[in-house]
Amino acid sequence: AGVFELQIHSFGPGPGPGAPRSPCSARLPCRLFFRVCLKPGLSEEAAESPCALGAALSARGPVYTEQPGAPAPDLPLPDGLLQVPFRDAWPGTFSFIIETWREELGDQIGGPAWSLLARVAGRRRLAAGGPWARDIQRAGAWELRFSYRARCEPPAVGTACTRLCRPRSAPSRCGPGLRPCAPLEDECEAPLVCRAGCSPEHGFCEQPGECRCLEGWTGPLCTVPVSTSSCLSPRGPSSATTGCLVPGPGPCDGNPCANGGSCSETPRSFECTCPRGFYGLRCEVSGVTCADGPCFNGGLCVGGADPDSAYICHCPPGFQGSNCEKRVDRCSLQPCRNGGLCLDLGHALRCRCRAGFAGPRCEHDLDDCAGRACANGGTCVEGGGAHRCSCALGFGGRDCRERADPCAARPCAHGGRCYAHFSGLVCACAPGYMGARCEFPVHPDGASALPAA
């Protein structure tokens, strides 16, 4: 058992021309969230088993509103990792699909609207317990930068999280620096130490002292990107400067970019500009193909005829979308208006309306004065998303249909007595007070304390 962890570093327009506009606008603020789906990489049943290793959904990111005229920046991301727990062995090779979703927060009827912005997929080799692996993927004009790792949950250990190690009651049986390992009580296990200098980012080991490279890296310590080498022969010891005696191959020599990508040198390494349909650090990832298992929910994947559609998913009943990601039922057509909840009763659909709405489709706005009659001369007043009747004197209730007791609210101040009257109420004031509601004290000299004009 263990956890696959995905950290999204950035999502925004990729380099090069055709950079997309921000997915949010001043009129339609939005926020991002991510979904990751994992499948065993070489599993034959991967096509039929959607997200067989698990899936996770991120939290929603901060709300973003486009600044008019500003270039589309990297978009604000949700906090935290996406974590996909796995119960069985970590397969070592896995396929992933990472989707970037946009939640529009405009005035959609029925709440926010979701749309898929980008989807990337790939197959990777990864040992559990190894360091974070970094990746860059492009989907159309968007670029997603992320890191991922798989780690075992105690007591599981090993590159597949299949061995169980737990402290024993008598750990002294093992020498210093060693720990006892179950299921064999008499076996002592050394903490795994890779070859000295093995790259913590690009290498890992399954046996002590070895250094195995993650995909895309080579060299004894996994520090050399595939197809590149920094120098053929170093300068002699007398040389004060570093560099190459014979101009060695530059980072682009031998073109590390696959699938017709073009290479350009950068201060630290190289960068590939990929042809349409390919992306990744070395253009090694083709769009998404059936090999990536992109069809969810048991969809059948068929290779597409042209580069723009590398695959087509034939969805099983009840699902649709380019990757069979959308559950389709009779409520999918959104028969309920104004945010009503659709319930499929089998023989019919029913709408459960939000407060303030009614009708079979929640189409009637109860908070709307249109067509709303206030009885007994009352007038309808809208405000705050609700309506109310402002009733004529002597009437009350939601629709002014109830005869009001004008004295119920004790309107006469300073102990005045209230009498209901056909035109409203009359206050009989206590000695020393006057006014329609007995609100003004009468001074001993006979003057009243009326407010100044």
Epitope: D329, S332, P335, R361
Partner: antibody, heavy 120, light 107 residues
Amino acid sequence: EVQLVQSGAEVKKPGASVKVSCKASGYTFTDYYMNWVRQAPGQRLEWIGIINPYSGVTIYNHKFKGRATLTVDKSANTAYMELSSLRSEDTAVYYCARQDSLLDYAMDYWGQGTTVTVSS
Amino acid sequence: DIQMTQSPSSLSASVGDRVTITCHASQGISGNMGWLQQKPGKAPKGLIYHGANLEDGVPSRFSGSGSGADYTLTISSLQPEDFATYYCVQYAQFPYTFGGGTKVEIK
């Protein structure tokens, strides 16, 4: 009286697109979904897709995915079905048919049909 | 997709006969099906919804029954205007699917 009146017959070349209209009257247009169904000569009826005229939400038969587009003009009480990349096997009579959006009545009223002929 | 298998594909009957047409769905559809009538050169017309309910204006000689995956349309006493092709349709699940039709001809 409920009526669905469709546009006239069309003759198109392979690869072209066709847009068929269906004007509704006699009921509240946005209270009923609009289905589109076709019938090729001597063949069974085939469902293309459905649209909720109130919200514009659509669901398509995966067989027509990417080729059929359903839209509505609420102000004109009219539904449209556009089929692109026409092939000879798209030669058929195309029908619109309304369906109650809640009680799920089967398609009770149908348009008179629009014959689309695809021929080079 | 749910397959709708209709039988017979055609039948000959006389005015006054009792006619039964059956439709079998490849999986249970909980009554979410209907029957349509189509005359040559005309659009289909709804007859029955939810397996057993008559659409407005449909004569009571038409009736529907069934549950699960098996449904029946019965015309108790065939009239001259009933000679047509009848289709079943399921709307339990997208995509909606139709039976192959039963042509009712005059004997």
